[in-house]
């Protein structure tokens, strides 16, 4: 059994997320998930679902009785998720930290937003798209 | 030419972004995506710039004056990002939405996380992963 | 201050097992990876394995994988690197490593800190 | 398989400036940190460069970390060259999940 499953359950009973009626009106993320198998759709995914765990968990970063709950399973989520590259964390922090709100960055985001834009395609920049994929524009 | 571009242009003389002086202090998201070469890893990124570009739009979807290239720059992230594939956009929506501090929220991210976790690595599902890759539990 | 203290090196014939520990102490032991690191006389820096912290996870060296294996007991603050069907060329000083913090974002460095190394002659 | 190539030896005169290389054989330098360490005889690795370009304390600034993603490598610059710097160098990153990886050592020889 992986370390994760006995800290998640400990978490539940903090959350007091074990009863059935937490699924009531449907699921978060599993639902989600279930419809997307290809790997890059599932990592688009799975991008926004991480963020949000982490969100989660700093809320209750100063909480004693939880703490080696949330510490392994983080850890659970960089060995998995990130492939315990911490330069891969490392970048998606800055990104999830980034305030909308700050005037500067609304600037810089906007200076680069056409080349940003440029790299969105899969394969923008190696010109492996398959034809099927193609933008056609007149 | 792609039909964001001048929009860009627009926004960038809206938000005062055309100036030499915006990338001062590195950019924002430029030199992380210039990090990541494979798609999945990109994704995992873009996933995170994508939904950040969302979030600032949204504060300025009653300026008019904006609105036209927002909506065009919008439309262009839907084809290119999304493959116009609404069914995507609108799962990526609904993640990026969820409240961190709203409780039920909350009970119901701890109560998936188990299975979450299950489905972080690559091929997780698939048993593709190579051997270099495997982590081994005593 | 952190310190690592690796132990049980020492002279070993071909095809013998033996097991060599390392003992932490001047941080959170269970929050840390642990690398183990090794070094033959007069030659480069070769990585063994690595355990990861909390969840210990064992990452090995393909060239390796299969005749060592990495354990620790986060209550004892130790690591065990235990070495088995040893051969002429594991003869190597043997450095246990603190690696990331991987439950924190702000982990110090990785490998900033080496113990001195414990010694592993395989000679007949 | 995953390689870091580093010259064999390297060597300047006093207060000049050497650099260091790192070839990354195959995969992205700039996906993996890249770590250098100093080795002096009879002592174990200390490092002087992490995460690519950061110094531990301790560390003095006339050593200098960089990576170029053009040419697939890091370097490690030492400026204002002195005696006590002559010692291996080593690069250090990564590869899949948490493999790590060294270069094969540099003799700084200081003249």
């Known amino acids: 059994q992986d370390p994760y499953v006995k800290e998640a359950e400990n978490l539940k009973k903090y959350f007091n997320a074990g009863h059935s009626d937490v699924a009531d009106n449907g699921t978060l993320f599993l639902g989600i998930l279930k419809n997307w198998k290809e790997e890059s759709d599932r990592k688009i995914m799975q991008s926004q679902i991480v963020s949000f765990y982490f969100k989660l968990f700093k809320n209750f970063k100063d909480d004693q009785s939880i703490q080696k709950s949330v510490e392994t399973i983080k850890e659970d989520m960089n060995v998995k998720f990130f492939n315990s590259n911490k330069k891969k964390r490392d970048d998606f922090e800055k990104l999830t930290n980034y305030s909308v709100t700050d005037l500067n960055v609304q600037r810089k985001a906007i200076h680069e937003l056409i080349q940003v834009m440029a790299e969105l395609s899969p394969a923008a920049k190696t010109g492996k798209r398959k034809r099927s994929q193609m933008l056609f524009r007149g | 030419q792609d039909p964001y571009v001048k929009e860009a242009e627009n926004l960038k003389k809206y938000f005062n972004a055309g100036h030499s002086d915006v990338a001062d202090n590195g950019t924002l998201f430029l030199g992380i995506l210039k990090n990541w070469k494979e798609e999945s890893d990109r994704k995992i990124m873009q996933s995170q710039i994508v939904s950040f570009y969302f979030k600032l739009f949204k504060n300025f979807k009653d300026d008019q004056s904006i609105q036209k290239s927002v909506e065009t720059i919008k439309e262009d992230m839907n084809v290119k990002f999304f493959n116009s594939n609404k069914k995507k956009r609108d799962d990526f929506e609904k993640l990026t939405n969820y409240s961190v501090t709203d409780l039920n929220v909350q009970r119901k991210a701890i109560h998936e996380l188990i299975q979450v976790m299950a489905e972080l690595s690559p091929a997780a599902k698939t048993g593709k992963r190579k051997r270099s890759q495997m982590l081994f539990r005593g | 201050e952190v310190q690592l203290v690796e132990s049980g090196g020492g002279l070993v014939k071909p095809g013998d097992s033996l097991t060599v520990s390392c003992v932490a102490s001047?941080?959170?032991?269970?929050?840390?990876?642990i690398h183990w690191v090794r070094q033959a006389p007069g030659k480069g820096l070769e990585w063994v394995a690595t355990i990861s912290g909390r969840t210990k996870y064992m990452f090995y060296s393909d060239s390796l994988r299969g005749r060592f294996t990495v354990s620790r007991d986060n209550a004892a603050n130790s690591v065990y690197l235990h070495m088995s069907s040893l051969r002429g060329e594991d003869t190597a000083l043997y450095y246990c490593?603190?690696?990331?913090?991987?439950?924190?974002?702000?982990?110090?460095?990785?490998?900033?800190?080496w113990g001195r190394g414990t010694l592993v002659t395989v000679s007949s | 398989n995953f390689m870091l190539t580093q010259p064999l030896s390297v060597s300047g005169y006093p207060g000049k400036t050497i650099v260091i290389s790192c070839v990354r054989s195959s995969g992205s330098v700039a996906s993996h940190y890249v770590q250098w360490f100093q080795q002096r005889p009879g002592s174990a690795p200390a490092m002087v460069i992490y995460e690519d370009s950061h110094r531990p304390s301790g560390i003095p600034d006339r050593f200098s970390g960089s990576v170029d993603a053009s040419s697939n490598s890091a370097s490690l610059t030492i400026s204002g060259l002195k005696t006590e710097d002559e010692a291996d160098y080593f690069c250090q990153s990564y590869y899949g999940n948490n493999q790590v990886l060294f270069g094969g050592g540099t003799k700084l020889t200081v003249l």
């Open positions: 490593v603190r690696g990331y913090d991987h439950s924190d974002s702000n982990s110090a460095a990785d490998l900033l800190h």
């Open positions: 001047g941080f959170t032991f269970s929050n840390y990876f």
